[in-house]
Interface confidence: medium
Amino acid sequence: NKGTDDATADSRKTYTLTDYLKNTYRLKLYSLRWISDHEYLYKQENNILVFNAEYGNSSVFLENSTFDEFGHSINDYSISPDGQFILLEYNYVKQWRHSYTASYDIYDLNKRQLITEERIPNNTQWVTWSPVGHKLAYVWNNDIYVKIEPNLPSYRITWTGKEDIIYNGITDWVYEEEVFSAYSALWWSPNGTFLAYAQFNDTEVPLIEYSFYSDESLQYPKTVRVPYPKAGAVNPTVKFFVVNTDSLSSVTNATSIQITAPASMLIGDHYLCDVTWATQERISLQWLRRIQNYSVMDICDYDESSGRWNCLVARQHIEMSTTGWVGRFRPSEPHFTLDGNSFYKIISNEEGYRHICYFQIDKKDCTFITKGTWEVIGIEALTSDYLYYISNEYKGMPGGRNLYKIQLSDYTKVTCLSCELNPERCQYYSVSFSKEAKYYQLRCSGPGLPLYTLHSSVNDKGLRVLEDNSALDKMLQNVQMPSKKLDFIILNETKFWYQMILPPHFDKSKKYPLLLDVYAGPCSQKADTVFRLNWATYLASTENIIVASFDGRGSGYQGDKIMHAINRRLGTFEVEDQIEAARQFSKMGFVDNKRIAIWGWSYGGYVTSMVLGSGSGVFKCGIAVAPVSRWEYYDSVYTERYMGLPTPEDNLDHYRNSTVMSRAENFKQVEYLLIHGTADDNVHFQQSAQISKALVDVGVDFQAMWYTDEDHGIASSTAHQHIYTHMSHFIKQCFSLP
């Protein structure tokens, strides 16, 4: 039933698959870069403008014609903190999720010319300005270099770099993906005197190898080899160093001082998981055991007389979990007060909700400054008077986000700065503060169209609207758009939230097919108040399909009781809860229980496959894109966080009980589409290859699609269009839609 009565009465067009694939209706962003406490840069028609936050007036910082003769397409730019130089990035070549190589040139803004001497080499892996002035640190061929002046020769800091073996100042694959979410492993001190860096050693890490087919003319495919530690395999080791960039000499090699991990870490495999400068001469390091329920923060001070860094055992802070793992994905970062003698950090409280705790560096215990059956998402700014944070407290909605400030002299004085600004349109905020938090940009991303506004911290006054997407609003008035329902069901006296993208003219007396869009990984959230234009918008608007998502056990931002429910048991409760959610949805009266499908990508592909292989009888069909199929195939840091080690003494039994392959027989009852990119460096093609083999071995007929040379995102323009077109055909066929 497509609700055609309503559709015929409404002459407006629907949001089509082409609209999604061609991005017909574009959400406008307002991406600013703060350069001081009252100024920001904003790119408009390729001119870089500098805006005064208080008054809103702007001037051209750099006109788009400046680089007309440059001869390269500029991918990105970065202005030195003193405003004297601009770093231009070009020849961008993507590597993994965050990493890339590029070429760089430096433009002198005073002389209005490019610096041609002592240029940064091509294929540089990372570059960063010092926080003040215009020093540069960069990584090339896995070694670190520092430039004190852009036009002078570089000082070489390390000499040990070796491709795929020793990484100085950059992360290896697993640290990039699972620990730092960045390629950079360099940390400047606040005034740019010291440069801290990590060194990763992958000598013993096994390689994942896969073919890359490249151009048709390549007779023999290339083999890509990446050091990639799978669950239980040999991990990279890490060392940490600090170098004083004020004492670099062209005569002698730079002296890097090592800071060793705490003794409680050195007894076994461990990770470096956070680096935060507290003051000019104080640094905090967080270390995490390979079994990720125990972490230690070291606070280390510079001793000028010896040139060494001392980390007092009395200042160590231990964070551990008895119910799961430390942090949401890793221990949270500390936010130090100006004197560096205390800090604020998000940790789990006694009730298992993540809140802000105030630590003094010499004391073990901390004082919680927030509390409640909700969670602090992030600390956004710290001034002498206030701490600003984002939480999901408002109206008890875990899928909402609002900005709060708490008075440091009286923790009972908490103000929500965003809750009532635009309560209907805006329930999901993020924020960007100016350098000293005098001003802030609020970015509202839903449930209405995105809205960007500028505010003053002095009186929390709204200064101006930066972007309201009014042009898009006008366009969408002529489109039959779906609506989004956010609600919860109660299972075993616990609230579990879901969202439904409902077709236009939704009528609860009619029956609609339902597609369950699943991720369901630890600390995930799919039910929220964000506005999106995506594949689900098309399915609901044009095909009259309800697209639902459900946050069951294992999901985040609702306390550890829910999140840690799947500890050591991936592939159990989070899978069962998706099946139960579909059962609950089919009882709501408007779902055609003969036409329920499920789909997911990555962890969602794993859950989709486990659900379809459960033999529940609830689902007619499903699509798994780039799924995990067996946890021993996935990386050590992510997998072991939740599953422990695949050894008989630890959790091998559950590793073996949680595979998709073991459920192959049950796929005879469903229609299954399996999709994977052949060059997936993250969830290896191996994972789908093994599903396919197991299904073939038991005689299951299924559909499959590979995407040659595509990685985990299957994001190249042609592949993106192809996969969504292919999945649309599959879903329409499954639901018997014309």
Epitope: M397, P423, K484
Partner: antibody, heavy 120, light 106 residues
Framework: EVQGVESGAELVKPGASVKLSCKAS????????INWVRQRPEQGLEWIGW????????KYNEKFKGKATLTTDKSSSTAYMQLSRLTSEDSAVYFC?????????????WGAGTTVTVSS | QIVLTQSPAIMSASPGEKVTITCSAS?????MNWFQQKPGTSPKLWIY???NLASGVPARFSGSGSGTSYSLTISRMEAEDAATYYC?????????FGGGTKLEIK
């Protein structure tokens, strides 16, 4: 079925107070705003304020501050509105209404209304 | 506060006739909701988030608009549509309702 059942009609004297109730059923009471709306005879609708039973937080229309006080009793899933220092101007039908979050949200369930007559 | 002005205040329409009720806001709002009220009953949600029909509302109704100008349209008037219609905004506090449009059948 989701519904809000309001207390019966009230006849009160000027200067007195009255406490209206709205008993909710069929949903999780603590998770949705309860709003109160006034409709004077032959007139339009005026929003008084909301209370969120989850934490007891409230938001009032400035016009009704000091006039209306909103409270809830979670154990009985009941919302209350106390109206004080009543005058003939306060004679009206008072509705409770649930605010639901579907996209930007809306008043989806209304009580039948309680008629308050202020007369000496 | 945002003032919502509905027009016309009263109108009558013949069966099958197209009806448009407008709601003008004193400053820009993100969305408009519409309610139908018949004598002696509580208001009923009719259109939410500007253009979405509430459950059970006939497809002859539609809503549109943005900024300060919104409307509710009935493509073909029927006797059961006779009622008072109110627009309502919650983009900024306080929530406000329009004065209502009383729609009668000829």
């Amino acid at each position: 079925e989701v519904q809000g059942v309001e207390s019966g009609a009230e006849l009160v004297k000027p200067g007195a107070s009255v406490k209206l109730s709205c008993k909710a059923s069929g949903y999780t009471f603590r998770s949705y705003d309860i709003n109160w709306v006034r409709q004077r005879p032959e007139q339009g609708l005026e929003w008084i304020g909301w209370i969120f039973p989850g934490d007891g937080s409230t938001k009032y229309n400035e016009k009704f501050k000091g006039k209306a006080t909103l409270t809830t009793d979670k154990s009985s899933s009941t919302a209350y509105m106390q109206l004080s220092r009543l005058t003939s101007e306060d004679s009206a039908v008072y509705f409770c209404a649930r605010w639901t979050v579907v996209g930007p949200g809306y008043f989806d369930v209304w009580g039948a209304g309680t008629t308050v007559t202020v007369s000496s | 506060q945002i003032v919502l002005t509905q027009s016309p205040a009263i109108m009558s329409a013949s069966p099958g006739e197209k009806v448009t009720i407008t709601c003008s806001a004193s400053s820009s709002v993100s969305y408009m909701n519409w309610f139908q009220q018949k004598p002696g009953t509580s208001p009923k949600l009719w259109i939410y988030s500007t253009s979405n029909l509430a459950s059970g509302v006939p497809a002859r109704f539609s809503g549109s608009g943005s900024g300060t100008s919104y409307s509710l349209t009935i493509s073909r008037m029927e006797a059961e549509d006779a009622a008072t219609y109110y627009c309502q905004q919650r983009s900024s506090y306080p929530n406000t309702f329009g004065g209502g449009t009383k729609l009668e059948i000829k």
